[in-house]
Interface confidence: low
């Protein structure tokens, strides 16, 4: 399924090259996008063509901070937006319950070492339902062709992934069991130890459990013990696949 999303996303990527001395990286963004009022949209950026280490990604709307994904501290959503903004997928951001006021420029700001800062721009237009439908009519033939191609590719990928997973299932099951026993017994991921990428830390001093895809939906926020200045996280972000 993730492969499908990646393929679909790749169709709309726009290159945003940076002309800045030694900085070789490129931010790819979803470019100009439109969505229907009341709906939701995924904002995506991807940093490529650099070996720089990503330490943090900021999402901003004009001058307002929406969210941050920090390599060590995980996700943080601005209190003003926490009801309508969800972290992910990946390092992207999902905006929900869109209003016309959400129309505007959005920026993904990648903090990297040693390159410095890379910025990508996305323009979002939130349309009234009728306008969105009207605009969609002109895109249907092209989208249909793209969708058909993608369905074929996706189906193939799903079949391959499913078969691979089936083979691995028994092995993974036993590994997970070992992990659970280990963490419950030894508290290897104690409150003062970092949680592994893609996981989040449960409340109080309990060892961290493995959680849903970088989202921490099933997990409590990081307990205050973890951070006594206002870095409240929703689980770690993994930057390992971000550059290339």
């Amino acid at each position: 399924m993730r492969w499908c999303l990646l393929l679909i996303w790749a169709q709309g990527l726009r290159q945003a090259p940076l002309a800045s001395g030694m900085m070789t990286g490129t931010i790819e963004t979803t470019g100009n996008i439109s969505a229907e009022k009341g709906g939701s949209i995924i904002l995506q950026c991807h940093l490529s063509s650099t070996t720089a280490q990503v330490t943090q990604v900021n999402w901003e709307q004009q001058d307002q901070l929406l969210a941050i994904c920090n390599a060590d501290l995980g996700w943080h959503i601005s209190p003003s937006f926490k009801d309508r903004v969800a972290p992910g997928p990946g390092l992207g951001l999902t905006l929900q319950s869109l209003t016309v006021n959400d129309t505007g420029e959005y920026f993904c700001i990648y903090h990297t070492y040693p390159d410095g800062t890379y910025t990508g721009r996305i323009f979002l237009e939130v349309l009234e339902s009728s306008v969105a439908e009207h605009g969609a009519r002109f895109q249907i033939p092209l989208l249909g062709a793209m969708a058909a191609t993608l369905v074929v590719i996706c189906t193939a990928v799903i079949v391959v992934v499913a078969l691979t997973r089936k083979k691995k299932a028994l092995r993974i099951h036993s590994v997970e069991g070992d992990l659970r026993r280990k963490s419950a017994g030894q508290e290897e991921w104690s409150p003062s130890a970092p949680s592994p990428p893609g996981s989040c830390v449960q409340a109080e001093a309990a060892p961290a459990g493995l959680c849903g895809e970088q989202r921490g939906e099933d997990c409590a926020e990081l307990h205050d013990y973890f951070n006594v200045l206002s870095y409240r996280s929703l689980g770690n972000c993994s930057f390992f696949t971000e550059t290339g």
């Epitope: 943090q56 060590d72 003003s80 970092p194 006594v228 200045l229 206002s230």
Partner: antibody, heavy 118, light 107 residues
């Protein structure tokens, strides 16, 4: 422009009281966790107290050395944070800084000098 | 309380020189560490947080690193405005605690 305007400090007798205030401008004060930090030649920089957000029911935390004597409070409508200091002793002498923190944003005010002496 | 041991307590260096200040945490702090700069007039500014993330507007000559329980702040090429006091701050658990500071002086 971000500003954290301090109140006047001053000289107070041992056992006395003093209230410090800090007025913020240039940022969304209500989103920020606010702290008081003090500095003295003897102890260096020392965190004193913290107050969180409305959504956290304005939860407060204090350093052990000031618990029961100091009270931190805030008024979001006035973008202000306060530190009420009672039963002051010589060990409370120092420069008091107000500090605002919201994820990657971090602001410090100018220090206010407090001297406890008879 | 978590003890933060900062070294050296003072350091003399020349313009253009590369300097490294270190901080050792007495307990695991998992990268929850920031570096602060205090100018002679008392103004405090955070330079780095999460051990290595540079604050907005801070020159790239500043960088932070973590190696186990040792944390370092490196200034790659000193400029005149860098001569100040530097402190590390852990915020992994209450109470947040500071290092004793490093006074960086011009040679």
């Amino acid at each position: 422009e971000v500003k954290l305007e301090k109140s006047r400090g001053g000289l107070v007798k041992p056992g006395g009281s003093m209230k410090l205030s800090c007025v913020a401008s240039g940022f969304t004060f209500s989103n920020f966790w606010m702290n008081w930090v003090r500095q003295s030649p003897e102890k260096g920089l020392e965190w004193v107290a913290q107050i969180r957000l409305n959504s956290d029911n304005y939860a407060t935390h204090y350093a052990e050395s000031v618990k029961g004597r100091f009270t931190i409070s805030r008024d979001d409508s006035k973008s202000s944070v306060y530190l009420q200091m009672n039963s002051l002793g010589a060990e409370d002498t120092g420069i008091y800084y107000c500090h605002g923190n919201f994820y990657d944003l971090d602001y410090w005010g100018q220090g206010t000098s407090v001297t406890v002496s008879s | 309380d978590i003890q933060m041991t900062q070294s050296p307590s003072s350091l003399s260096a020349s313009l253009g020189e590369r300097v490294t200040l270190t901080c050792r945490a007495g307990q695991e702090i998992s990268g929850f560490l920031s570096w602060l700069q205090q100018k002679p007039d008392g103004t405090i500014k955070r330079l780095i947080y999460a051990a290595s993330t540079l604050d907005s507007g801070v020159p790239k000559r500043f960088s932070g690193r973590r190696s186990g329980s040792d944390y370092s702040l490196t200034i790659s090429s000193l400029e005149s405005e860098d001569f100040a006091d530097y402190y590390c701050l852990q915020y992994a658990s209450y109470p947040p605690t500071f290092g004793g500071g490093t006074k960086l002086e011009i040679k």
